[in-house]
């Protein structure tokens, strides 16, 4: 940091701005009297080069003209772009210990001539709005740059602005604070920039325009919507514009969604009927302007409209099942099962169901609201009976989904064959089945019905469903399906007035049980003996058991155990074998084995046969 | 398993009260639809109340207005409250509940509890 300039001068040829490459003269010259005191031929003056307030280089090789103890000249090059600091130091050669005192200090700057500003735009917001310019200023100059905008028009009208970039601010932009006015539109406006530094200067091409290039609407504002006669499907859409607007763009969309509905209106004059939308759907609304049919600009979009579109009568039909118990010698009970409907079909917060349940030759009708999707019903086993449920929102009721209620797996003949599940992955399994070889009529529909086979509510965990056309032998089922969880799969063949099933196990991924079943007793009946076992808890079946080993040896003995397979049934739990000695004792243990493998061992009872065996 | 245990039963006149109770413990975890059946000697057990895990409940049409089937969650515990009792249902009541594994029905049953009505 210099203050003044006491000790002498410091001067720069050809100037302290220089374009890229050049070369520079810096002479450092002593003031008269002044020096190192006794003895002014040890006066030695140096030059030191500083970058961001960094010595980076002392210039003692670079004198190229010296007059011993007055003055000395350095040559510079290879400046780079920016700003360099210089400082001429006096160094007294005889006196060691002391440091070189500042004589004085220049800044050199070296730069570029700016290039002529390009791609000039200019727009006024609104009617009422400024001319605003915005230029492409070409490469950095490293200078102080002034930057004039002149605009001139019809009726000599002029006014220019300027504006300046340096190495803290960038002008690249002009508002010129006057405003065009719509009785002009027909008239032509130039512009043009004009750059200026040090190093030289340069000027846009002119940019013509007109009032109709330039303006661009504010966007519409107050936008709100009114429903004819409380419609879900039909509102008006109004909103105040700017007076000469006479093009709108509207767009609008469900908020979910992620493609716009577009709409173009003429002299919409600030309001727009629109005929399509979905009852009951969360929508955003914006509208853009334009002040001409064929040229100028479009506004921003407007802030969006957020609204709720009003309920509709629900439509669609409910996808119905149910489920059919015998619950005492004349009594059974019926649980009416049914999906949601779909946002598009409910149009609506589905407030209750309306259901039926009807005899239909002694015309007994059993009548129910419920805002649950299951419905249960004692009625007698007798008769023909029919269900309809119908769902109900705040504008009406769809129309009633009817099913007759028949003995779901009561026809042998409507049974599909070679049913068979296979996981396709974590989450889902394929069932596939053939026709039934002889229904004597038609098969109207198959069900798909699956059920995880672990201790469940009847009416807390329903089933799951799919419905599938007569002439398709296959379903992909992946709701509610988990890894490592056995379902009982049925498919249902259903005619007009019976019905088949067939049942299988599946599950969409497996590994080998965590344990064996627990042998309970071991007893001896008619030189059997019986084994009985507690199924392994479900959580720990990790996926469709296939078969139960039971494994037996002598006590003591090293040989490898016998076994027995049996075929896995959840109603079984006991297992006759007769292959053992009497009066041996034997250890047995049961293991379970899944598609992924065998479990551990379960516990290991010893038993010792009285009778005669074999 | 599933215990059930009825309790409640009694002598009573024609046309006067009784509210039976039913506690189910062991693993009821998927124990929600509880029923009442009741049998008389020589006859077959018939259904006579249930109430499901959304609360819903159905009656025998002979009882239906007499009797009201509540349940208490916390508890483990459903009740059959019954009001102006006739010697006709002078039967031994049952308490069952049911859960499904897979497509089988699972049924649990208690020991049952004597109600008399006497005229």
């Known amino acids: 940091n210099i203050d003044v300039c006491k000790l002498g001068t410091v001067t720069v040829q050809p100037a302290p701005v220089i374009p890229l490459g050049s070369a520079a003269n810096i002479s450092c010259s002593l003031n008269p009297k002044q020096g190192c005191s006794h003895y002014p031929s040890s006066n030695e003056l140096i030059l030191l080069k500083f970058v961001n307030d960094v010595l980076v280089e002392n210039l003692h090789g670079k004198k190229v003209h010296d007059h011993t103890g007055h003055s000395s000249t350095f040559q510079v090059t290879n400046l780079s772009l920016g700003m360099t600091l210089f400082v001429c130091k006096l160094n007294c050669s005889n006196s060691q210990k002391k440091p070189p005192v500042p004589v004085c200090g220049v800044e050199i700057s070296v730069g570029v001539a700016p290039e002529p500003p390009q791609n000039i735009s200019c727009v006024q917001e609104g009617e009422n709005g400024t001319v605003a310019c915005s230029w492409n200023s070409g490469k950095v100059t490293y200078l102080k740059t002034n930057y004039t905008l002149q605009l001139s028009g019809p009726n000599n009208l002029t006014c220019q602005k300027q504006c300046f970039s340096d190495n803290r601010q960038n002008c690249n932009r002009l508002d010129l604070g006057i405003n065009l006015s719509p009785d002009l539109a027909e008239s032509r406006f130039i512009v043009r920039v004009t750059a200026i530094n040090d190093l030289g200067n340069s000027s846009s091409l002119p940019h013509t325009f007109t009032f109709l290039d330039i303006v661009i609407p504010l966007p519409p504002w107050d936008i709100r919507i009114n429903f004819l006669n409380a419609s879900g499907s039909r509102g008006t859409l109004q909103w105040e514009d700017e007076g000469q607007v006479v093009l709108n763009q509207l767009r609008y969309q469900p908020l979910n969604s992620t493609s716009w509905n577009m709409v173009n209106a003429t002299n919409a004059k600030g309001k727009y009927d629109l005929r399509d939308l979905r009852p009951f759907t969360e929508y955003e609304f914006q509208i853009s302007s334009k002040l001409h049919l064929s040229g100028g600009s479009w506004s921003n979009w407007s802030e969006s409209l957020r609204t709720r579109t009003p309920e509709e009568e629900p439509v669609g039909i409910l996808d119905i099942w149910y489920m059919k118990q015998d619950i005492d010698y004349d009594r059974q009970q019926i649980s009416l099962f049914w999906k949601s409907l779909n946002p598009s079909e409910a149009r609506g917060k589905i407030l209750h169901y309306q259901v039926t349940l009807q005899e239909v030759t002694k015309k007994t009708t059993l009548q129910n609201t419920t805002r649950h999707t299951s419905w249960t019903r004692v009625i007698p086993r007798t008769g023909a009976w029919t269900a309809s449920v119908s769902a109900a929102n705040s504008k009406g009721a769809s129309a009633p989904t009817h099913i007759n209620i028949v003995d779901l797996c009561g026809t042998g003949l409507l049974a599909p064959h070679q049913v068979s599940a296979k996981s396709e992955n974590m989450d889902n399994i394929l069932v596939t089945w053939q026709p039934p070889k002889k229904a004597d009529s038609a098969v109207r529909e198959y069900i798909v019905e699956w059920r995880a086979l672990q201790p469940g509510s009847i009416t807390k965990f329903p089933p799951h469903w799919l419905r599938i056309p007569p002439d398709n032998m296959s379903a992909l089922i992946s709701e509610n399906i988990k890894p490592y969880i056995c379902y009982e799969i049925r498919v249902h063949a259903l005619s007009e007035s019976q019905g088949g099933c067939s049942s299988i196990r599946g599950d969409s991924k497996h590994k080998a049980p965590v344990s064996g079943p627990h042998i309970t007793a071991i007893t001896e009946k008619k030189e059997r003996l019986f084994i009985s076992w507690t199924h392994i808890p479900f959580p720990e079946q990790r996926g469709c058991i296939l078969h139960y080993r039971i494994y037996w040896k002598e006590r003591d003995s090293t040989a490898q155990p016998e076994l027995c397979e049996i075929q896995y049934r959840r109603s079984q739990n006991s297992h006759p074998i007769s292959s053992l000695q009497p009066r041996v004792t034997y250890v047995l243990w049961m293991t379970a084995v899944t598609a992924a493998g065998e479990s551990p061992q379960g516990n290991e009872r010893e038993f010792c046969p009285q009778g005669k065996a074999n | 398993q599933v215990q059930l245990q009825e309790s409640g039963g009694g002598l009573v006149q024609a046309g006067d009260s009784l509210r039976l109770s039913c506690t189910a413990s062991?693993?009821?975890?998927?124990?929600?639809?509880m029923y009442w059946y009741r049998q008389a000697p020589g006859k077959q057990r018939e259904f006579v109340a249930y109430?499901?895990?959304?609360?819903?409940?159905n009656y025998l049409d002979s009882v239906n207005g007499r009797f009201t089937i509540s349940r208490d969650n916390a508890e483990n515990s459903v009740y059959l409250q019954m009001n102006s009792l006739k010697p006709e249902d002078t039967v031994v009541y049952y308490c069952?509940?049911?859960?499904?594994?897979?497509?089988?029905?699972?049924?649990?049953w208690g020991q049952g509890t004597q109600v008399t009505v006497s005229s």
């Open positions: 069952n509940a049911k859960q499904i594994v897979g497509f089988q029905i699972d049924e649990y």
């Open positions: 062991g693993s009821i975890f998927a124990i929600d639809d």
């Open positions: 109430i499901t895990a959304t609360n819903s409940a």
